[in-house]
């Protein structure tokens, strides 16, 4: 039989009163033993055989010191088997054994749940010698018990290479419920059911759960732990917690906020970082995500021009980074730009629109009617062309770039010349004789260099050859121009 010491009676619904055979008393007075004498209370003996030592795990000494008669078997005396107490209280329990004086150097060790307790534990062993035997009392005390002190404690004594083991003493530390699982904050879809979980443990058991939503109890009756609450859907943010109850009282979980997913707020602070003739680099600050991660964003671009058809160009981009290079724009044009982002619920409204402009573009056409003459007397090549018909967006013509490539006997050399916008002719020095000179011309604006004209080739003879025939840009569709000598 297990003798059980209880700190207090359990009210309904666990137990209606003290258990049969239990000891209803203050734990410290029950379990302390006097240290000043060898007195041992009856509690230390087995309740099944009053006055007889417990003989569960024994060592049998063979003879007395006189070598004549057998000694009784050695065993720890039976003690209290189960101690129930509240967290933060102090407890003291002990083992006792009477050992014939023939044995020397007997030591008692304490074990908890199969592991020896070493170091900073309050274990005291006291010896009470008599004529033939020594009573040994090993006390173990714990101050301010915690749940981690729960377990089965035993004494062990080594004697003559035999191990004597006491009956276990079960320590049950009771306290308020302890949460092993609490509800977690969540972001949920409007009017969609979801689950919350709450789990708490004792001892004492049972632990009962009440759910609380926005300060109102969800379940009128307690539910056994663990409990899963299926929330049937929310239309607005709510705060949930759970109460765990046992006979010691109540513990309340953390309150968790459940948010309702919504469309994001519009982005703010759309800014222009860089403009070129055909692209604009923008950035924005994302709005509130509506409790659901952004999926992507949409950049909307409208041309601000009374003559434009007012159509909107839409460029889809990832939500991060919060930047986008808008391409394929007209040069020297004004645009209105807005940004919208989406999450799983839908698209945000568009950000406040901002105005942005592209810069001048490079010319889109090459100079026309390029002709090339050899002026042998001056050792020059004369080049003439007609100004290209550039669009307004290309900006103002600032000049021309002339590329002339000299090729002879496997050697090739390209040279570039810049001339002003008022010119439509240029002269370049002959670089190499007995060579071919290939000329191309491009118009230049602040926006950049336009396309080069089709190449015009002229052969530069060795000194003494006379030839003034021009080379010129062919009419569209003709083959590459060549010098006709």
């Amino acid at each position: 039989a297990i003798t059980e010491a209880r700190e207090e009676a359990k009210p309904y619904p666990l137990f209606p009163g003290p258990l049969p055979g239990s000891l209803q008393t203050d734990h410290t007075s029950l379990l302390s033993l006097p240290h000043t004498s060898g007195y041992q209370p009856a509690l230390m003996f087995s309740p099944t055989q009053p006055g007889r030592p417990y003989t569960g795990n024994v060592a049998i000494p063979r003879v007395t010191s006189a070598g004549s008669k057998l000694l009784p078997p050695l065993a720890f005396k039976h003690t209290v088997g189960h101690i129930i107490l509240s967290e933060h209280k102090d407890v003291k329990f002990n083992c006792s054994i009477s050992v014939p004086n023939i044995y020397q150097d007997t030591t008692i060790s304490w074990w908890k749940d199969g592991k020896e307790l070493l170091g900073a534990h309050h274990a005291i062993t006291q010896f009470y010698p008599d004529d033939e035997v020594t009573a040994i009392i090993a006390s173990f005390s714990i101050t301010s018990v915690q749940r981690s002190d729960n377990g089965s404690y035993i004494c062990k004594m080594k004697i003559n290479n035999e191990e004597i083991v006491s009956d276990p003493i079960y320590i049950e530390v009771q306290g308020l419920p302890h949460f092993t699982k609490q509800p977690e904050s969540m972001n949920v879809t409007r009017n969609t059911a979801f689950n919350l979980t709450c789990q708490a443990v004792g001892p004492p058991e049972p632990v009962n759960i009440f759910w609380v939503q926005n300060s109102s109890r969800v379940n009128e009756q307690p539910e056994k732990s663990p409990s899963v609450l299926t929330v049937p859907g929310l239309t607005e943010m709510a705060v949930f917690s759970c109460e765990a109850h046992n006979d010691k009282g109540l513990t309340v979980s953390k309150g968790v906020q459940i948010n309702i997913k919504a469309i994001p707020s519009p982005p703010t602070e759309v800014s222009i970082h860089n403009s070129t003739a055909h692209s604009i680099l923008i950035s924005w600050v994302p709005g509130f995500d509506g409790y659901s991660p952004f999926r992507n964003c949409s950049v909307q671009v409208k041309e601000v021009d009374p003559l434009s058809n007012g159509s909107v160009m839409i460029f889809n981009t990832s939500a991060s980074p919060h930047m986008y290079q808008i391409k394929q724009l007209q040069a020297l044009a004004n645009y209105s730009i807005g940004v919208s982002c989406m999450n799983e619920i839908g698209w945000s409204a568009v950000s406040p629109w901002i105005l942005a402009s592209t810069t001048e573009g490079a010319p889109s056409v090459a100079p026309l009617n390029v002709t090339v003459f050899l002026n042998e007397s001056r050792d020059n090549v004369d080049i003439r062309w007609m100004k290209p018909l550039t669009k307004r967006q290309a900006g103002e013509l600032v000049g021309y770039r002339i590329s002339h490539v000299w090729q002879s006997a496997g050697i090739s050399k390209e040279l570039l010349e810049e001339v002003g916008q008022n010119n439509s002719r240029a002269q370049i020095s002959v670089q190499v004789h007995n060579a071919t000179c290939t000329v191309r011309i491009a118009a230049v604006t602040k926006g950049g260099v336009g396309p080069f004209s089709d190449p015009v080739k002229i052969f530069i003879p060795a000194h003494g050859w006379v030839d003034h025939a021009p080379s010129s840009t062919p009419a569209p569709g003709n083959a590459d121009p060549v010098l006709i000598i």
Epitope: P13, V218, Q221, P232, G233
Partner: antibody, heavy 118, light 106 residues
Framework: QVQLVQSGSELKKPGASVKVSCKAS????????VHWVRQAPGQGLEWMGW????????TYAQGFTGRFVFSLDTSVSTAYLQISSLKAEDTAVYYC???????????WGQGTLVTVSS | EIVLTQSPATLSLSPGERATLSCRAS?????MHWYQQKPGQAPRPLIY???NLASGIPARFSGSGSGTSYTLTISSPEPEDFAVYYC?????????FGGGTKVEIK
Amino acid sequence: QVQLVQSGSELKKPGASVKVSCKASGYTFANYGVHWVRQAPGQGLEWMGWINTYQGEPTYAQGFTGRFVFSLDTSVSTAYLQISSLKAEDTAVYYCARGVRYAYMDYWGQGTLVTVSS
Amino acid sequence: EIVLTQSPATLSLSPGERATLSCRASSSVGYMHWYQQKPGQAPRPLIYATSNLASGIPARFSGSGSGTSYTLTISSPEPEDFAVYYCQQWSSNPRTFGGGTKVEIK
């Protein structure tokens, strides 16, 4: 299947007492509260209160304290409504209903008509 | 206590004509439940927690709302839907019912 079966109609004189029973079956009685609802002739539903079947603790709505008593016999999974010092205005159909989360009454008894007349 | 006001008190409809029943609370509530009652019968659960159909309830019934304003809709009433409908709030004690809306055949 879940069922709540109420006792039969009662005809009582003013000042007398009546005890209406509500026997539950098809579920664990102690897991769900029992609500009581009154409906006077030609009137709407009026919540009287409920009893916690786990602890036996009753909760009464305003206007239903004093003469009205909710009780249990868990051994037979039965809830009771007792009304003492009956008055003519207590004439009504009394319903019991099983309460679940969010105070929703998912199963109802068939109702017990209590008539108070001299 | 939270007072629930149902409107209209009576709704006269032809079968198939959409029915919209309103339940207003004197202060914000978490959920609204709806029950149907026919003469001589116990109330029957209809909608749980604002918008969830009770078992066996046909899809022509739907519930919506939040805060202080809740609605029960019968998209195309059948002859068996003509009855009295009650709302009941969950938020605070005491649990209160609305006064009921009678849906009758025009």
